[in-house]
């Protein structure tokens, strides 16, 4: 019996087609992805093959103005239109709190939404009961397939799930659900979830009875043969893991942003054992036409976005200096504003020992693309912020050793004075450079804001200590020559859309007046 698994993950609000790098589509003839194009391909496969499941491994939420405006309603609407069979909860599904998940998505989705390792407690337990499930058994042709969900146990540090959801260890939570499915006579089981490729592989190895793992969170691109675009494969598709009980378990993921549709064919024997598996992600490029009815629906929903982008978010009473003449040479107040917004967006998990789990921000000056003049009645709009941050990136959470941070700050000024983009703007950091010294030895003082303290204060950076830092995904991926961050980071979790982070902060503050205050000397 053969099953075709179509899968997406980390779509992050890319409802419209995008450019090849998943930013805003400029030249339509070279654009990719989007739900209208995805629907064309899905329908083509559904017509051609008998047993097809369309699955999403989480993080549909967060990433473009679509999510900012529609807050998840767009996800439910278009996933319903594409007739997804199941979805696992990702960490970003909690970005607007539990209510922001329940109302727009859980209550509106016509497909099961899954996570076995999220347990509700207190007053939330009855409110959310039945709205998401640990598993679902789906009829496929004359057979049934069990889908069991999981979500990153780091979600409380990455999003806003509140205090009434407990995120358990994935493997510990999955095993009893898989055992139950097996005992209920479900002999074909897919683990669908959002914890990253390393955890996906562990699940394949450790959870007895799981036949296939469909993952997300780490934006992993797997491919067999010559890859069709810019993404470099992290391994073959499917990636085969030998389980502890000796089975060969295929593990798949489909990069991110709806650029690819994962396509996996699995052959099962009559007892539900995997005989063979093969496939590849399908690049959703312009050779695949956009479905006209979905496209028309997208255009209808688009109207509200255009109106939103010109509305006032808040006011500035000072000039927001985002000029390259400032931000690539010295501390600039636009850099301070953005870093303050980045930290504010990550305020969570205070306890008696930590005022917050992260206090530091770094931001490449070259990523700040425009100033905002306060003389337009002080008004700040989404449109203004899109000029400052035009690349459609995210502000991510990483863990780095102090020694890596020191290297990053040396790199920041290794060729100072040439108006290059690697000059770092900061938050929660005081750095002093001596530019008379030779490159690689110019950082003379580097103090960082404590987190394990009731009164935050600046302490010298310790080389062997592990620090959490918020930074643009561009830097986490080694951009602007920050290879040491990419090579030495100990953990990387994708965060929220950059413009959204700043716009939320400005809306919250109402009036802003960021200063140049001696963070960089």
């Amino acid at each position: 019996w053969e099953l075709t698994i179509l899968h997406t993950n980390d779509v992050h609000s890319r409802l419209e087609q995008t450019s090849e790098d998943s930013s805003k589509c400029v030249n339509a003839s070279r654009c990719m992805g989007g739900v209208a194009r995805l629907f064309t391909k899905v329908q083509q496969i559904r017509r051609a093959e008998p047993n097809v499941l369309l699955l999403d491994a989480g993080d549909q939420y967060q990433g473009t103005i679509w999510f900012t405006v529609y807050k998840g309603a767009e996800v439910a609407h278009f996933m319903n239109a594409l007739r997804y069979d199941a979805m696992a909860l990702g960490n970003h599904e909690f970005d607007n709190g539990v209510e922001g998940l329940i109302e727009p998505l859980l209550k509106e989705a016509k497909f099961p939404i899954l996570s076995a390792n999220i347990k509700a407690k207190g007053p939330l337990a009855s409110q959310i009961s039945g709205l998401y499930l640990p598993y679902k058994v789906l009829p496929v042709g004359d057979e049934v397939v069990g889908i069991v969900g999981y979500t990153s146990k780091e979600t409380p540090f990455l999003s806003n799930p509140g205090t009434n959801l407990v995120f358990e260890d994935e493997i510990t939570a999955l095993q009893p659900e898989v055992d139950k499915l097996k005992t209920l006579n479900v002999n074909k089981i897919i683990a669908l979830g959002h914890s990253g490729f390393e955890t996906d592989k562990l699940i394949a190895q450790k959870v007895r009875g799981v036949d296939v793992v469909v993952g997300g969170h780490s934006n992993t691109f797997l491919y067999t043969g010559n890859p069709p675009s810019k993404e470099v494969p992290a391994g073959k598709y499917p990636f085969i893991v030998t389980s502890d009980d000796g089975r060969k378990v295929p593990v798949v993921q489909a990069y991110a942003f709806g650029k690819y549709l994962g396509y996996l064919k699995i052959e099962f024997d009559e007892r539900g054992n995997v005989i063979s598996s093969h496939g590849n992600p399908i690049l959703l490029n312009s050779s695949i036409p956009e479905d006209p009815s979905i496209k028309a629906d997208i255009n209808k929903w688009r109207i509200k976005l255009d109106n939103y982008s010109t509305q006032e978010l808040g006011k500035t009473i000072v000039y927001l200096d985002g000029s390259s003449q400032s931000c690539r040479f010295r501390e600039c107040n636009m850099g301070n504003l953005i870093c303050d917004a980045m930290i504010n967006n990550n305020l969570r998990h205070a306890d008696e020992m930590f005022w917050n789990h992260v206090s530091m921000c770094i931001l490449n000056g070259g990523g700040i693309r425009s100033p905002i003049d306060e003389r337009n009645n002080g008004t700040i709009t989404w449109e203004n912020l899109a000029a400052v941050l035009p690349f459609g990136g995210t502000f991510d959470l990483v863990q780095l050793k102090g020694s890596t941070l020191k290297k990053a700050f040396e790199h920041s000024v290794h060729r100072y004075g040439q108006s290059t983009g690697e000059f770092l703007q900061v938050g929660g950091i005081h750095v002093v450079y001596d530019l008379s010294r030779k490159p690689g030895d110019r950082v003379v003082k580097l103090d960082v804001l404590c987190t394990k303290c009731r009164v935050p204060s600046y302490d010298p950076l310790k080389m062997d200590e592990i620090y959490k830092v918020i930074l643009p995904n561009f830097l986490a991926n080694g951009g602007d020559g920050f290879q040491m961050i990419k090579d030495e980071l100990l953990r990387h979790d994708s965060g929220d859309q950059d413009i959204n982070v700043v716009s939320t902060y400005i809306s919250k503050m109402k009036v802003i007046y960021p200063a140049v205050e001696g963070r960089i000397k």
Epitope: V137, V144, K180, T183, L184, N185
Partner: antibody, heavy 120, light 107 residues
């Protein structure tokens, strides 16, 4: 032919124990999940417990959890139900039933039943 | 736990009558419902599985329908051997549960 035969029922005092057996024949016993279902006099059917084909997974009705233990010996083609701390409300005909191989579980083969009476 | 509520609890009918028994689940169980017939002093016998599939050897006058929460067992033309008690059963999740039963009696 395919059949299930229960034994071990009888009259027992409250708080005491009893062990039921179910001998299977005519099919590959080790391929099937096996169940106990009971029926109190004049009442409906109540599912009691299940054990998976190889015996590693077991599930129980809340009414018997912690008191009853289901087990199997695939080499002897036999299913067991160890009943401890028996109560008057456990009085019933106990059937063993084969859960067939497809989902959802339905019981396609039943034993004739064995009567358990809990009375002082 | 998933509760199954059968109605009516008993029905009087004559040979040749069409008899309909309903079973309502306390939550969505897709089409994962079975029906059994039990005669006094005997073990139950499987009639219908997956809501509407007829078990082999069961006469075609028995049929099942429904999905989600509402299910029906229909006997199109009651025969003398059909006077018995009928139970619905779900195995969507543990614990497996049965309906309270419907007794079909001779009018």
């Amino acid at each position: 032919q395919v059949q299930l035969v229960e034994s071990g029922g009888g009259v027992v005092q409250p708080g005491r124990s009893l062990r039921l057996s179910c001998a299977a024949s005519g099919f590959t016993f080790s391929h099937y999940g096996m169940h106990w279902v009971r029926q109190a006099p004049g009442k409906g059917l109540e599912w009691v417990a299940v054990i998976s084909d190889e015996g590693s997974n077991k599930y129980y009705a809340d009414s018997v959890k912690g008191r009853f233990t289901i087990s199997r010996d695939n080499s002897k083609n036999t299913l067991y139900l160890q009943m401890n701390s028996l109560r008057a409300e456990d009085t019933a005909v106990y059937y063993c039933a084969r859960g067939w191989l497809r989902y959802p579980i339905a019981f396609d083969i039943w034993g004739q039943g064995t009567m358990v009476t809990v009375s002082s | 736990d998933i509760q199954l509520t059968q109605s009516p609890s008993s029905v009087s009918a004559s040979v040749g009558d069409r008899v309909t028994i309903t079973c309502r689940a306390s939550q969505d169980i897709s089409s994962w419902l079975a029906w059994y017939q039990q005669k006094p002093g005997k073990a139950p016998k499987l009639l219908i599985y997956a809501a509407s599939s007829l078990q082999s050897g069961v006469p075609s006058r028995f049929s099942g329908s429904g999905s989600g929460t509402d299910f029906t067992l229909t006997i199109s033309s009651l025969q003398p051997e059909d006077f018995a008690t009928y139970y619905c059963q779900q195995a969507n999740d543990f614990p497996i549960t049965f309906g309270g039963g419907t007794k079909v009696e001779i009018k």
